[in-house]
Interface confidence: medium
Amino acid sequence: MKVLQEPTCVSDYMSISTCEWKMNGPTNCSTELRLLYQLVFLLSEAHTCIPENNGGAGCVCHLLMDDVVSADNYTLDLWAGQQLLWKGSFKPSEHVKPRAPGNLTVHTNVSDTLLLTWSNPYPPDNYLYNHLTYAVNIWSENDPADFRIYNVTYLEPSLRIAASTLKSGISYRARVRAWAQCYNTTWSEWSPSTKWHNSYREPFEQH
């Protein structure tokens, strides 16, 4: 049994880091493998992660972490029974994938303005709370070409757009994702999408 693709890990910079790797053949990850991880810190203890299958030869493990600070470094040991298959390390702050925003809501009752709001996925005491920026994706269910991205580079988790920038009388969906420039993170997953029917009063045309 050998590791074909070494584990790569990303952290949500809060409580979970996810590591993925591939073996050289079909493997029952949860029964055959264990990923041991330990914070390089005098008071820390080793923890064991039981991997799950992620395709025939792929494995994924969700490492639980109390909290994360930028100086943290973890040792990782991948075991198959008594055999050490791979040894490495992982610095969460250098491999951050933020949590996805939640509670995306479209408020349509604000005088021909659409107000989209969502929740910051981090608690206020987390470093990323004040460092997230967002991308909002809006698309038409009827027209695949009607697909747009709005970059929200301010901290407030909201976006206002004129309803008239979208077509009237059809349904739209929106979703939002986050990233943090400070740690050069990857984008988060998209939030669940929300749907609304776009309608607004056409301006009276004078001839």
């Epitope: 810190f41 005098l42 008071l43 909290d67 600070v69 930028s70 100086a71 943290d72």
Partner: antibody, heavy 120, light 106 residues
Framework: QVQLVQSGAEVKKPGASVKVSCKAS????????INWVRQAPGQRLEWVGW????????YYNEKFKDRATLTVDKSASTAYMELSSLRSEDTAVYFC?????????????WGQGTLVTVSS | DIQMTQSPSSLSASVGDRVTITCRAS?????MHWYQQKPGKAPKPWIY???NLASGVPSRFSGSGSGTDFTLTISSLQPEDFATYYC?????????FGQGTKVEIK
Amino acid sequence: QVQLVQSGAEVKKPGASVKVSCKASGSTLTDDYINWVRQAPGQRLEWVGWIFPGNGNSYYNEKFKDRATLTVDKSASTAYMELSSLRSEDTAVYFCARGLVRYRALFDYWGQGTLVTVSS
Amino acid sequence: DIQMTQSPSSLSASVGDRVTITCRASSSINYMHWYQQKPGKAPKPWIYAASNLASGVPSRFSGSGSGTDFTLTISSLQPEDFATYYCQQWSSYPITFGQGTKVEIK
């Protein structure tokens, strides 16, 4: 809100022992490392050792290993530091302080300090 | 033992000044903490793990550094900031503190 309340000032003769208490409220002490730190007049802070009440494990600064004893009474939420064979250079304010792994062992709560004076 | 050396040992500054205190470890460490102490009082936690402000610490304070060199910076000194600041390491035993930096009013 966690509070650490220490026993009152002590005056001791050289060669004697002193036992300082540190009572915790708002915390069960279970997940806390209770540290003892001293500060002689005008000097830097000096770490004596820690005790982990969850299992009674303790760890000492080699400098104090032979003279300091750290204990805990979990039922009373109280930690103790006993220092024996006192000498004049042990005159200092002794603090208890909680260290949490979550904050990478930052001492986040401190007692008010107990002045121990060693004088003949 | 890892020796922690702070510089300067004391400094005089005026309200509004930018102040930087440095702490050098005699060998590389992974976690550095800072405390503020006022006369007759216990130290208060100020910055943990080099750069994270402890609860209630004003945002004019910041911390940085890694390895052997760490800094505490006050962007605009306020009257309540006059105190002694200590660095501390818990990366190897024994836990050690710097000798302190006393920030005084000019």
